[in-house]
Interface confidence: low
């Protein structure tokens, strides 16, 4: 039975973080989801990814601090370094929900976590680095415009001791460490994947009970490359991951490969383009996409096809499968356990056969040997005597793998702000590096399209100012 006035909420600030949000969404869907799924996005999320997000999330809500109510705009102007934090605080405005659980886009849900909704505001798990503070990657909150205003006021007056949302929320909910123990979530609800646990007996004892894993630190799962044939995550340079982190990374990539990549091929040409009523690329703030005569928002087509992903010969809108490829096949797992009324096609990749796919669902000639669902990989983490084992009807059947051709279409690539390179032996996700002129940079800022996590990070701006002032 679904509970319509409660929701899991996440935030995706750009196309890269959307990959994490999609994995998180699909991992939640996999475990008897009974609540709504909501994703907050910022204006720079591309139109194509908005469409894909809408296949996984019940609500995709754009948050634009520049266009916001006066008091939000004022807070942003006063504390521009807290742009990302103020965006995250927007979750308190979701007042059509009585209670929500916020999960960062770099988390992965390993089992049903409905019991979190039994907790009150403000519930969170201790931070591994300083357990008297909570980690703000997973928390239970009650939407309220009053609380939202108080949080913004607090942000303006006090800033954040760590320059991010965690510092701000800890100073706002400052009694968390000393009051109600019920508001201390067990560590298994926000297990840091990359901490080399000093108390390793505890990890051995309790790590297998983990319900939510959090990929803290600068190396996110999408920063690694993945070999779908061996099912292994490829190490990046000097970065080496511990055995348990490798297992969690493998889980993340398994979900990505089986339940996120197929969504790209199910997006039809018209879907990324035609959205009556409001612009995909926010023409109302002079964005890069001109409105077409039909009043339909066009996706941004302002970059050349990425070198990493060669272009296909067939145009995006083609109704014919690419030559030499089999007809699109439908894969719908009838045994999939879904929330009341939800059709499995919403989550699993291939479009219905009467609507020809833009990207043909071409099974690779050599299916990958690795387990395609969680159950086998979870044995790395779960002891045999674990009570809550995942029942077979909850498991995604292996979905057909995404062929390398799938993402070669130039207009599909142009619509994304990321380079997705997919081959038989490697999948990688990289940020598109687009050199903008100073004028374009300034216009992006004026439009509120600020990359808080990347090149517009406060530290980088400070660096530039320091150089300028020297």
């Amino acid at each position: 039975m679904s509970v319509t006035d409660q929701a899991f909420v996440t935030l995706a600030t750009n196309d890269i973080y959307c990959q994490g949000a999609l994995v998180l969404g699909q991992s939640l869907r996999r475990h008897r989801l009974t609540r709504k799924l909501v994703v907050l996005i910022t204006p720079q999320v591309s139109s194509l990814l908005r469409v894909i997000l809408s296949k996984v999330f019940d609500e995709v809500i754009e948050v634009n601090l520049i266009d916001s109510a006066d008091y939000i705009h004022l807070a942003f102007l006063k504390r521009p370094e807290l742009g990302l934090t103020l965006t995250k605080l927007h979750c308190w405005t979701l007042t059509h929900y009585s209670k929500c659980v916020f999960l960062d886009a770099d988390t992965l849900v390993l089992s049903n976590v409905d019991e979190l909704f039994d907790r009150g505001e403000f519930s969170a798990a201790p931070d591994p680095g300083w357990p008297d503070c909570f980690n703000s990657g997973v928390f239970v909150f009650q939407p309220s415009l009053h609380t939202h205003k108080l949080l913004l006021q607090h942000a303006m007056e006090h800033g954040s001791f760590d320059g991010a949302d965690q510092g701000l929320l800890n100073s706002f909910f400052r009694n968390w460490s000393t009051t109600d123990i019920h508001k201390h979530l067990p560590f298994i609800y926000n297990l840091s994947s990359n901490t080399m646990y000093t108390y390793s007996p505890a990890f051995k004892q309790f790590g297998s009970s983990a319900k939510v894993v959090h990929f803290l630190g600068s190396m996110k799962p999408w920063n690694y490359k993945y070999n779908p044939q061996s099912g292994s995550v490829l190490e990046q340079g000097s970065v080496s991951s511990s055995q348990h982190q490798a297992a969690f990374l493998h889980l993340w990539w398994t979900v990505y490969q089986n339940n996120v990549l197929p969504l790209y091929k199910s997006v039809q040409a018209g879907e990324a383009r035609a959205s009556p009523g409001h612009t995909l690329c926010r023409s109302d703030v002079g964005g890069p996409c001109a409105d077409s005569a039909s009043g339909v928002g066009e996706p941004c087509e302002n970059s050349t096809p990425s070198a990493g992903v060669p272009c296909a010969n067939s145009p995006l809108g083609s109704n014919q499968p690419a030559q030499g490829l089999p007809e699109p096949t439908q894969i719908v797992d009838e045994t999939l356990s879904l929330p009341e009324g939800r059709r499995s096609e919403d989550m699993i990749a291939c479009p219905e056969t009467e609507t020809p796919a833009v990207i043909t669902c071409d099974p690779l000639s050599q299916p990958s040997p690795q387990p395609a669902d969680f159950t086998e990989t979870e044995t790395i983490l779960q002891p045999a005597n674990k009570v809550e084992s995942v029942s077979s009807e909850e498991t995604f059947e292996p979905s057909q793998e995404l062929p390398a051709e799938a993402l070669r279409d130039p207009s599909l690539q142009d619509a994304l702000e990321v380079d997705l390179a997919v081959s038989v032996s490697q999948i990688s996700i990289e940020e598109k590096v687009k050199e903008l002129s100073p004028e374009e940079e300034r216009r992006k800022w004026e439009e509120g399209r600020i990359d808080y996590m990347g090149k517009d990070a406060f530290a980088r701006i400070q660096e530039k100012l320091d150089r300028f002032l020297q």
Epitope: A69, P339, R342
Partner: antibody, heavy 119, light 109 residues
Framework: VVQLGESGGGLVKPGGSLRLSCAAS????????MNWVRQSPEKGLEWVSY????????DYADSVRGRFTISRDNAKNSLYLQMNILRPDDTAVYYC????????????WGKGTTVTVSS | EVVLTQSPGTLSLSPGERATLSCRAS???????LAWYQQKLGQAPRLLIY???SRATGIPDRFSGSGSGTDFTLTISRLEAEDFAVYYC??????????FGQGTKVEIR
């Protein structure tokens, strides 16, 4: 061309039933949250029922709860409203409308179909 | 239940003039969830503004929305002949999911 076309309206006696249909074309129906909204001179615009893009979530106005049933068939690009135990105050023009991505507003509307409940 | 009250009920203006329409909520509404629609006689409503201030596709820039909390405004900077219609504000909440204002009629003076 983006279009929603309602059908199934008509004259019905109090206590009777009607089934309204809404056919969508020109856009990806399965990505839209859909609603039925009605309009009468007495009550103005009044939201009746909502169904999420996948059909998972359904909601009704208190005035119709238990009497009306909303449903959708994404394969057929169609939205339906089954109206039972109709009352004179259900008399109105019924519109189907949809919202893309978010359900908070309605960016596409049909032309409406008239339902008259009278003895 | 959030009640939206629009004022004035009727606004009589000439083409080229500025129109300011008000929508007041009985309790605070998130600006993310406030929309404005235009309806001409015999036609369905048409979305103008969503999220209190974002213009929908194809809507001329003479239409703008503003406000937060309980007070929202739709402004038409220079009225054109096709702008004479009825305007409704709408909020999205929990129960009922949507509520509409009673409308403001903008008529030619």
């Amino acid at each position: 061309v983006v279009q929603l076309g309602e059908s199934g309206g008509g004259l019905v006696k109090p206590g009777g039933s009607l089934r309204l249909s809404c056919a969508a074309s020109g856009f990806t129906f399965s990505s839209y949250h859909m609603n039925w909204v009605r309009q009468s001179p007495e009550k103005g615009l009044e939201w009746v029922s909502y169904i999420s893009s996948s059909g998972t979530y359904i909601d009704y106005a208190d005035s119709v709860r238990g009497r009306f049933t909303i449903s959708r068939d994404n394969a057929k690009n169609s939205l339906y409203l089954q109206m039972n135990i109709l009352r004179p105050d259900d008399t109105a023009v019924y519109y189907c409308s949809g919202g893309y991505y978010s359900s908070s507003h309605m960016d596409v509307w049909g032309k409406g179909t008239t339902v008259t409940v009278s003895s | 239940e959030v009640v939206l009250t629009q004022s004035p009920g009727t606004l009589s203006l000439s083409p080229g003039e500025r129109a300011t329409l008000s929508c007041r909520a009985s309790q605070s509404v998130s600006s993310n969830y406030l929309a404005w629609y235009q309806q001409k006689l015999g036609q369905a409503p048409r979305l103008l503004i969503y999220g209190a201030s974002s213009r929908a596709t194809g809507i001329p820039d003479r239409f703008s929305g503003s406000g937060s909390g309980t007070d929202f405004t739709l402004t038409i900077s220079r009225l054109e002949a096709e702008d004479f219609a009825v305007y409704y504000c709408q909020q999205y909440g929990s129960s009922p999911r949507y509520t509409f204002g009673q409308g403001t009629k903008v008529e030619i003076r």
